[in-house]
Amino acid sequence: AITEAREEAKPYPLFPGPFPGSLQTDHTPLLSLPHASGYQPALMFSPTQPGRPHTGNVAIPQVTSVESKPLPPLAFKHTVGHIILSEHKGVKFNCSISVPNIYQDTTISWWKDGKELLGAHHAITQFYPDDEVTAIIASFSITSVQRSDNGSYICKMKINNEEIVSDPIYIEVQGLPHFTKQPESMNVTRNTAFNLTCQAVGPPEPVNIFWVQNSSRVNEQPEKSPSVLTVPGLTEMAVFSCEAHNDKGLTVSKGVQINIKAIPSPPTEVSIRNSTAHSILISWVPGFDGYSPFRNCSIQVKEADPLSNGSVMIFNTSALPHLYQIKQLQALANYSIGVSCMNEIGWSAVSPWILASTTEGAPSVAPLNVTVFLNESSDNVDIRWMKPPTKQQDGELVGYRISHVWQSAGISKELLEEVGQNGSRARISVQVHNATCTVRIAAVTRGGVGPFSDPVKIFIPAHGWVDYAPSSTPAPGNADPVLII
């Protein structure tokens, strides 16, 4: 049976009884090998008589002495089987064996949980020689035990390639409970149940768990570790921790905050990054997410003109990257812009509204009803048109650009004229006779040049022809009208 020794027990005797060969307590060791830097198995030098191989944990010598008495089987002496002590205490234990002097080159090594202990362990092997046998004591000490020192320790001795193994010495290091699983912070839906888990281990066992919510014990009775706390639901933020108790005392887990998911706060700092005639690039700083990730955002745009109908345009976008280009806006217009974002709980309120304006743009349509006719008397071409609708001018008209292309007998040349915004007619000199003149007109604002009107062609005859009628912008579907006079 395993004997058990608690840390309060008196020091263990090195071995239960005297060694064969009547080892006296006043003998001093012949050889003492402390292993400081690296573990070196102790070598025992004895008279050179070979031992025989054996099987198992006991070596049965086959050699007989001069009187032909058989040698006893070799085995480690029984020692303490179980040592229980607290963390950071010191411990020393040993293996002992008596080896007939006929054996040579014996080595003792320490093993823990099946692995040889190499390195800076405090292992000392002492030899006490006598006439027929040498008593060997292998001591192992740990100055400040830790949980990692828990385990089963054995001695192994090699004699002529045969192995003798001692009984195990179980070291049990006891201390305060050690958490293997602590509760985790969570974001939960209001009034919805959730679980928290806490697990701690000894030794010593058992480990009992108490849950604490906002500094108040939750469970009246301790629960054996591991413990799962089911919280039926919260209406406000709470802090949970768990206490782990064993016979050595108490360890408290980290406190974790359980947050209640809520609608987000409205975005802040909505700002204009860039404006064009028909788009505005905005950015914003997201508000507090309400402990639930943002899903998407909504940009609300309304015309700031008091005469507008007050309708709101809504643009939906992803929550990232807190940037959105609002398109399809009118040029040179004022808008109020607000941003709202949503998480799984719902939509935030709208951010504070900001005012933004689009810039002037090039007109979006060409002048209308372009007509061209030849004034033969002055050798000019007269051009007339209607200005584009105000809404589609996309700014303040500063004038018009007229393109007239003259084509005759394989020669073509284009001329551009700029005219002021006043009026809606222009006159250009005939450049080439017996040629076709193609006219296109574009409106111009400070924002740029708009699209050119559809081409209107007029044939300019040689001198002496009569001016009958104008050419005009074709009706849709008609191509390249040519008026030959």
Epitope: N208, Q213, S216, R217, E220
Partner: antibody, heavy 117, light 108 residues
Framework: QVQLVQSGAEVKKPGASVKVSCKTS????????MYWVRQAPGQGLEWMGI????????TYAQKFQGRVTMTRDTSTSTVYMELSSLRSEDTAVYYC??????????WGQGTTVTVSS | EIVLTQSPGTLSLSPGERATLSCRAS???????LAWYQQKPGQAPRLLIY???SRATGIPDRFSGSGSGTDFTLTISRLEPEDFAVYYC?????????FGQGTKVEIK
């Protein structure tokens, strides 16, 4: 570890009230379940009630319902047991106890209440 | 409420002897939530056993608890002089929590 220290002995007249205090020392940042138990001279233990630390809910034994009030002052880590309409049979040692590591494993030293005209 | 009946009322034994104390409940005790306390004159009770069979910290292993449902037992394997006292069982599985009337262990 937690210790419970109770107020001193009281002598009361029948019909009066008594308020016994029980101060927690040690781990005062946690509010524990608190119990009150009494023991009349030469008699056994009698459970009076429990003060739950969550919202300070209380459960009283039927026998004391309407006469006993258990409260907590978090700022001083003290719980109180007030017993009203005292009778001579309320003469007893009153104990507070708590669950620290195991159920009711820490007890106060007891407060003797004597009801005598 | 659950009524706990302890027997015997008094147990007269000598040091070194084994003491067996019984506690019977009028109905099943939930989760075996039954505790045993020791009380000496002029002192507060001291928890020995909780959960019917688990020893509290610092309680010598000569004290052991057993039983379930309605029948529970406290055993002191070898009485020491300091073990002579009154022992109470208490159920804490339902309200009101109730105590047995006690068993006095006295020196024979």
């Amino acid at each position: 570890q937690v210790q419970l220290v109770q107020s001193g002995a009281e002598v009361k007249k029948p019909g009066a009230s008594v308020k016994v205090s029980c101060k927690t020392s040690g781990n005062t940042q946690i509010r524990y379940y608190m119990y009150w138990v009494r023991q009349a001279p030469g008699q056994g233990l009698e459970w009076m009630g429990i003060l739950n630390p969550n919202q300070d809910q209380t459960t009283y034994a039927q026998k004391f319902q309407g006469r006993v009030t258990m409260t907590r002052d978090t700022s001083t880590s003290t719980v109180y047991m007030e017993l009203s309409s005292l009778r001579s049979e309320d003469t007893a040692v009153y104990y507070c106890a708590t669950t620290y590591r195991y159920y009711m494993d820490v007890w106060g030293q007891g407060t003797t209440v004597t009801v005598s005209s | 409420e659950i009524v706990l009946t302890q027997s015997p009322g008094t147990l007269s034994l000598s040091p070194g002897e084994r003491a067996t104390l019984s506690c019977r409940a009028s109905q099943s005790v939930r989760s075996n939530y039954l505790a045993w306390y020791q009380q000496k004159p002029g002192q507060a009770p001291r928890l020995l056993i909780y959960g019917a069979s688990s020893r509290a910290t610092g309680i010598p292993d000569r004290f052991s608890g057993s039983g379930s449902g309605t029948d529970f037992t406290l055993t002191i394997s070898r009485l020491e002089p300091e073990d002579f006292a009154v022992y109470y069982c208490q159920q804490y599985g339902s309200s009101p929590r109730t105590f047995g009337q006690g068993t006095k262990v006295e020196i024979k």
